[in-house]
């Protein structure tokens, strides 16, 4: 069964700057990744970035840099200035659309006890939705 993992880290240098990393553990071909915050995409969440493996990347403030880390994982840096900046308990979600598995989404937030610069290991987060 495919799984999605989400890792959220607060940068030590900028306490209101976050890095979100997401990955897909499955054998299928990824066709699209959508990163949102405030809840799952399409369920109250606001899209931060959409990444297509070949067509390109679209991102919106406060996202600063979205990129593919590998063929099955992505990272997104959020800059934390202004009213739309994230806070420590913000939920971030990643939805991977893949063939033939369908869509798989997981969410994560900053670990409650984490110090700046530290992060939880990138273990698979609970899968919230699987649209097959």
């Amino acid at each position: 069964t495919p799984e999605v993992w989400v890792q959220v880290r607060m940068e030590a240098t900028e306490l209101s700057s976050f890095t979100i990393r997401c990955g897909f553990l499955g054998s299928g071909s990824i066709s699209l990744v959508t990163v949102s915050w405030g809840g799952p995409n399409g369920a109250g969440g606001t899209t931060l970035a959409v990444l297509h493996p070949e067509r390109g990347i679209r991102q919106w403030a406060p996202a600063r840099q979205a990129r593919w880390e590998t063929q099955s994982s992505i990272s997104l840096i959020l800059e934390g200035s202004g009213a739309s900046s994230p806070c420590a308990n913000t939920t971030f979600c990643c939805k991977f659309a893949s063939f033939p598995e369908g869509s798989w989404e997981a969410c994560g937030s900053l670990p409650p006890s984490s110090d700046p610069g530290l992060s939880a290991p990138p273990t698979p987060a609970p899968i919230l939705r699987a649209d097959l």
């Epitope: 959409v50 919106w60 994982s73």
Partner: antibody, heavy 114, light 113 residues
Framework: EVQLVQSGAEVKKPGSSVKVSCKAS????????IEWVRQAPGQGLEWIGE????????NYNEKFKGRVTFTADTSTNTAYMELSSLRSEDTAVYYC???????WGQGTLVTVSS | DIVMTQSPDSLAVSLGERATINCKSS????????????LAWYQQKPGQPPKLLIY???TRESGVPDRFSGSGSGTDFTLTISSLQAEDVAVYYC?????????FGQGTKLEIK
């Protein structure tokens, strides 16, 4: 198949504003950004910016910041581009596009002339 | 901004012959993480909007004839039409799909010799 249908041609005076609409059908309007691109007569393509209709998040080409505004109405699947302080150099065909420029509207000719 | 430069500006090729258009970017369009090049090619005929032909430097958009092919990596890319047809007369544009703002080449006008 996504279809984008734009509003008709406009003739405007210098200093005025123009608002171009782009109605989408056949796809998920709020999931992908609507891009705006213009093409002056006999010239190349120039990206103006984009809006993500679901959240109204926008990105603008620095060249147009302060003069262009994007809005979107998800109830009618329509995106809008308003360009203000028009000058003769803004005479161009304005296109909306979606899904990484895979789908395009037919274009709207905006002529700025005194 | 990434500057896209196409060559030649215009090109005349006989029907059935090969047409080659080059595109050079001022910065690499290669995403090192997934080894994909974010470059697209468009065809525009008079009075029509551009039509996406190629994305990811080499992937043909659905419905595009297989005589169109894209190649290249990093900063140097090529669009090839293997056997020119009359309906291929148009202006062709390359586009940076790697970073904001998306920028286009100046265009290459393709005509029949």
């Amino acid at each position: 198949e996504v279809q984008l249908v734009q509003s008709g041609a406009e003739v405007k005076k210098p200093g005025s504003s123009v608002k171009v609409s782009c109605k989408a059908s056949g796809g998920t309007f709020s999931s992908f950004s609507i891009e705006w691109v213009r093409q002056a007569p006999g010239q190349g393509l120039e990206w103006i910016g984009e809006i993500l209709p679901g959240s109204n998040s926008t990105n603008y080409n620095e060249k147009f910041k302060g003069r262009v505004t994007f809005t979107a109405d998800t109830s009618t699947n329509t995106a809008y581009m308003e360009l203000s302080s028009l000058r003769s150099e803004d005479t161009a065909v304005y296109y909306c596009s979606s899904y990484w420029f895979a789908y395009w509207g037919q274009g709207t000719l905006v002529t700025v002339s005194s | 901004d990434i500057v896209m430069t196409q060559s030649p500006d215009s090109l005349a090729v006989s029907l059935g012959e090969r047409a080659t258009i080059n595109c050079k970017s001022s910065q690499s369009l290669l995403n090192s993480g997934n080894q994909k090049n974010y470059l697209a090619w468009y065809q525009q005929k008079p009075g029509q909007p551009p039509k996406l032909l190629i994305y990811g430097a080499s992937t043909r958009e659905s419905g595009v004839p297989d005589r169109f092919s894209g190649s290249g990596s990093g900063t140097d890319f090529t669009l090839t039409i293997s056997s020119l047809q009359a309906e291929d007369v148009a202006v062709y544009y390359c586009q940076n799909a790697h970073s904001y703002p998306p920028t286009f080449g100046q265009g290459t006008k393709l005509e029949i010799k």
